[in-house]
């Protein structure tokens, strides 16, 4: 007989699992890039902005090889779950500049969120602990201006972007290794 | 013009290395990563590996871990690929091309830079 | 490594005619709404080119007698109707896994 009902499935493949994670991850980079050649295009960018409130980036050019796949899906579910509340916060706040986008921001934050439910359903089903956040949540007040919040939007897009190339990058090579 | 511009072709004896430069141009140079591709007389393309130049962070194909070695300087706009140990069957073109891992495609290439490993 | 197998090898045609290009995988590589193949063409002496990315969208600049089309593990390019410039060899390439390959060509002849 199987498991009782309700209790998670445990994987027979974890790599099929991760392969699984991967894809939807790359699928996430896609809309992401896009999204963000479209805000380059609409609201052109002067130079690199930042925003205070987001994740710190995870990685550098010599942490790739030492990468483990429990501190790997743990950080990125931290980060993802920082970008999706600065995705939501974006949508509500971000004023009439970013009301053309946000059919776009919509479907991020559904992918984003599809995403978050795969890492949770993968570290259950590797038996790792959910984490909670390790950094303090900081509450994101209204944008200065209409200017403030299309940098705030460049910043959060060229963020996701770069985090997950990371993951992508981090996942295809755990999955060989696995 | 979106343009990848590699560096001459190279004579090299077995056993050195050799260090390959692309220059882009056209576009925002850390808006794509920079992906090589090998190209063995009468072989299939054959991907080395791929760098994300914002961050670094390069991926390689199994095969060519531990000898290959790509870097980037941004300020310059260029990503280079070293090759070390050499041997006869690392004869071949070698191209530098422009990627993203969403899709991973190769949309801009270089004109390639031919590596002849003789004694 | 997922494995592409090109056929046929080489092909003969004459201008004006249509050329069928089939790609094979050894395992499927579409998935989430994506088809990884991508297809370029490269002639003696120079670079490849792509022609078209994710199974079946043309690249900008690429002229419109070129097609992609397939799912799963069978792929096809087809060249409506061959020009001069249209020989050369034709590559597919998958994105679906880490690494990337490609497959071994099929080279376009004028008969």
């Known amino acids: 007989p199987g498991p009782p009902a309700g209790s998670p499935r445990v994987s027979s493949d974890p790599r099929a699992d991760l392969d699984s994670a991967v894809l939807l991850t790359r699928s996430l980079l896609a809309d992401t890039r896009q999204l963000a050649a479209q805000m380059r295009d609409k609201f052109p960018a002067d130079g690199d902005h930042s925003l205070d409130s987001l994740p710190t980036l995870a990685m550098s050019a010599g942490t790739l090889g030492s990468l483990q796949l429990p501190g790997v899906l743990t950080r990125l579910r931290v980060d993802l779950m920082s970008y999706l509340r600065h995705v939501q916060w974006l949508r509500r706040a971000g004023g009439p500049s970013l009301k053309t986008l946000e059919p776009e921001l919509g479907a991020l934050q559904a992918r984003l969120e599809r995403l978050l439910r795969r890492l949770q359903l993968l570290m259950s089903r590797l038996a790792l602990p959910q984490a909670a956040p390790d950094q303090p949540v900081i509450p994101l007040g209204p944008p200065a201006s209409a200017w403030g919040s299309i940098r705030a939007a460049h910043a959060i897009l060229g963020g996701l972007h770069l985090t997950l190339d990371w993951a992508v990058r981090g996942l295809l090579l755990l999955k060989t290794r696995l | 013009e979106v343009q990848l511009v590699q560096s001459g072709a190279e004579v090299k004896k077995p056993g050195a290395s050799v260090k390959i430069s692309c220059k882009a141009s056209?576009?925002?140079?850390?808006?794509?990563?920079m992906d090589w591709v090998k190209q063995a007389p009468g072989q299939r393309l054959e991907w080395i590996g791929d760098i994300n130049p914002t961050i670094g962070a390069p991926i390689y194909n199994q095969k060519f871990t531990g000898r290959a070695t790509l870097t980037v300087d941004k300020s310059a706009s260029t990503a280079y690929m070293e090759l070390s140990s050499l041997r006869s069957e690392d004869t071949a073109v070698y191209y530098c091309a422009r990627g993203e891992l969403a899709h991973w495609y190769f949309d801009v290439w270089g004109q390639g830079t031919t590596v002849t490993v003789s004694s | 490594d997922i494995v592409l197998t090109q056929s046929p090898a080489s092909l003969a045609l004459s201008p004006g005619e249509r050329a069928t290009l089939s790609c094979r995988a050894s395992?499927?590589?579409?998935?989430?709404?994506?088809?990884?193949i991508h297809w370029y063409q490269q002639k003696p002496g120079q670079a490849p080119r792509l022609l078209i990315y994710l199974a079946s969208n043309l690249e900008s600049g690429v002229p419109a007698r070129f097609s992609g089309s397939g799912s799963g593990t069978d792929f096809t390019l087809t060249i409506s109707s061959l020009e001069e410039e249209d020989f050369a060899t034709y590559y597919c390439?998958?994105?679906?896994?880490?690494?990337?390959?490609f497959g071994q060509g099929t080279k376009l002849e004028i008969k």
């Open positions: 056209g576009y925002t140079f850390t808006d794509y990563n």
């Open positions: 395992k499927s590589v579409s998935t989430e709404g994506y088809s990884y």
């Open positions: 390439q998958h994105s679906r896994d880490l690494p990337p390959t």
